[in-house]
Interface confidence: medium
């Protein structure tokens, strides 16, 4: 988790002299309780947008949006404490927004907005924003949160952002797979404008089981220059297992940027239908 | 269902040393904050120090900065407050409570556990 770089963190507004800065997440009202403490955030809203920084990379970033209550409460607010929180790994980031100036009630409901968080793809995160001061221990809670899932780099936009371009993101390979005669594989798929290798890992499975019956792993050497884009074409030959018929089939690029964390492909080959056997004819009808 | 049960108190003279511990049960969430608060007779709680277990920042009280030192134990779901220095104003009975956000508004608290420190 980071803030974004490309510029200064504003939240001043007309009517507000605002300040961002840097937070622990451990906003120390609580340690310092006052008697008097704003409502909640309403309407928080989270949504995905993107931003380049000064270096021109494009990131997924958290869009964050919240309203003001129109209650007096408002005379006592302070500022805002952002947190977001990456939900696998426990990772937490926060700023705070410090009112220098009083709000007041004006003819349009407050707004406030931040995107600087830049966000993960295929990541969920939990957002909160709490008003400050925090309330007195035991009080009413003046915080909302939300839960914000980024898409993966499948994503139409996501794909071309820097994070999903560096893991391999606008390389499509057209993966096909075709069953050969004595039990082969014959796997064919397009090859990157990188002399890099890659890694074709093959797991068979039972018709309708999901422990496999199979592995194996078979090198592709870096391609020449002249080959880039060309399709490369394996044949794997299958262990000949009586109802190890499903065939997945991934190819694992190496690529400069991912190294040996690049997106992967896959394809599956299903088993072939069983056709329905007939009842068996008797060889003579009983008389009885 | 969350269970917080603090131990460690008890009397020591001015200038000695005490470590409450705080064991903690129940607890769904993979991350949370926990704080110490102290409650004085006739006086309003108040916090003393707190955690956050995702990546263990802390934060204190200006009244015990430098005497005091919160920490954590995952392996055993354990909060700690370690006291050095002690001073008799900071007898009371001590509390910890855990929090999924940071403002200890809607906490589970343990029974609490007294300190009693003498001049």
């Known amino acids: 988790l980071r803030l974004l770089d490309h510029r200064a963190l504003v939240c001043s507004q007309p009517g507000l002299n605002c300040t961002v800065k840097n937070s622990t997440c451990l906003d120390d009202s609580w340690i310092h309780p006052r008697n008097l403490t704003p409502s909640s955030p309403k309407d928080l809203q989270i949504q995905l947008h993107f931003a380049h920084t000064q270096q021109g990379d494009l990131f997924p970033v958290a869009h964050i949006e919240w309203t003001l209550q129109t209650d007096a409460s408002i005379l006592y607010l302070e500022g805002a404490e952002l947190s977001v929180l990456q939900l696998n790994t426990n990772e937490r980031l926060c700023v705070r927004f410090e009112f220098l100036s009083k709000l007041r009630h004006h003819h349009r409901r407050w707004r406030f907005t931040f995107s600087h968080f830049v966000v993960d793809p295929d990541q969920e995160y939990e957002v909160t924003v709490h008003h400050l001061p925090k309330p007195i221990p035991d009080g009413d809670p003046n915080h909302q949160s939300k839960n914000f899932l980024v898409p993966d780099c499948e994503h139409a936009r996501m794909k071309v952002t820097t994070p999903c371009m560096s893991s391999g993101s606008l390389w499509d390979p057209n993966i096909t797979v075709e069953t050969l005669e004595a039990h082969q594989l014959r796997v064919s798929f397009t090859l990157w404008n990188e002399s890099t290798h890659y890694q074709i890992l093959l797991t068979s499975f039972p018709h309708m089981e999901n422990h496999s019956c199979f592995e194996h792993m078979h090198h592709i050497p870096a391609p020449r220059p002249e080959e880039f884009h060309q399709r490369s074409n394996v044949t794997l030959t299958l262990r000949n297992l009586k109802g190890c018929c499903r065939h997945q089939v991934q190819i694992q690029p190496f690529f400069s940027s991912c190294l040996n964390d690049c997106l992967r492909h896959s394809a599956t080959v299903s088993c072939p239908e069983m056709p329905d056997t007939p009842e068996p004819i008797p060889d003579y009808m009983p008389l009885w | 269902q969350v269970q917080l049960q603090e131990s460690g108190g008890g009397s020591v003279q001015a200038g000695g040393s005490l470590r409450l511990s705080c064991a903690v049960s129940g607890y769904t969430h993979r991350s949370y904050y926990m704080g110490w608060f102290r409650q004085a007779p006739g006086k309003k709680r108040e916090g003393v120090a707190s955690i956050y277990t995702g990546d263990g920042s802390t934060h204190y009280a200006d009244s015990v900065k430098g005497r005091f030192t919160i920490s954590q134990d995952n392996a055993q779901n354990t909060l700690y407050l370690q006291m050095n220095s002690l001073k008799p104003e900071d007898s009371a009975m001590y509390y910890c409570?855990?929090?999924?956000?940071?403002?200890?508004?809607?906490?589970?608290w343990g029974q609490g556990t007294q300190v009693t420190v003498s001049s």
């Open positions: 409570a855990a929090d999924t956000q940071n403002s200890f508004t809607a906490p589970y």
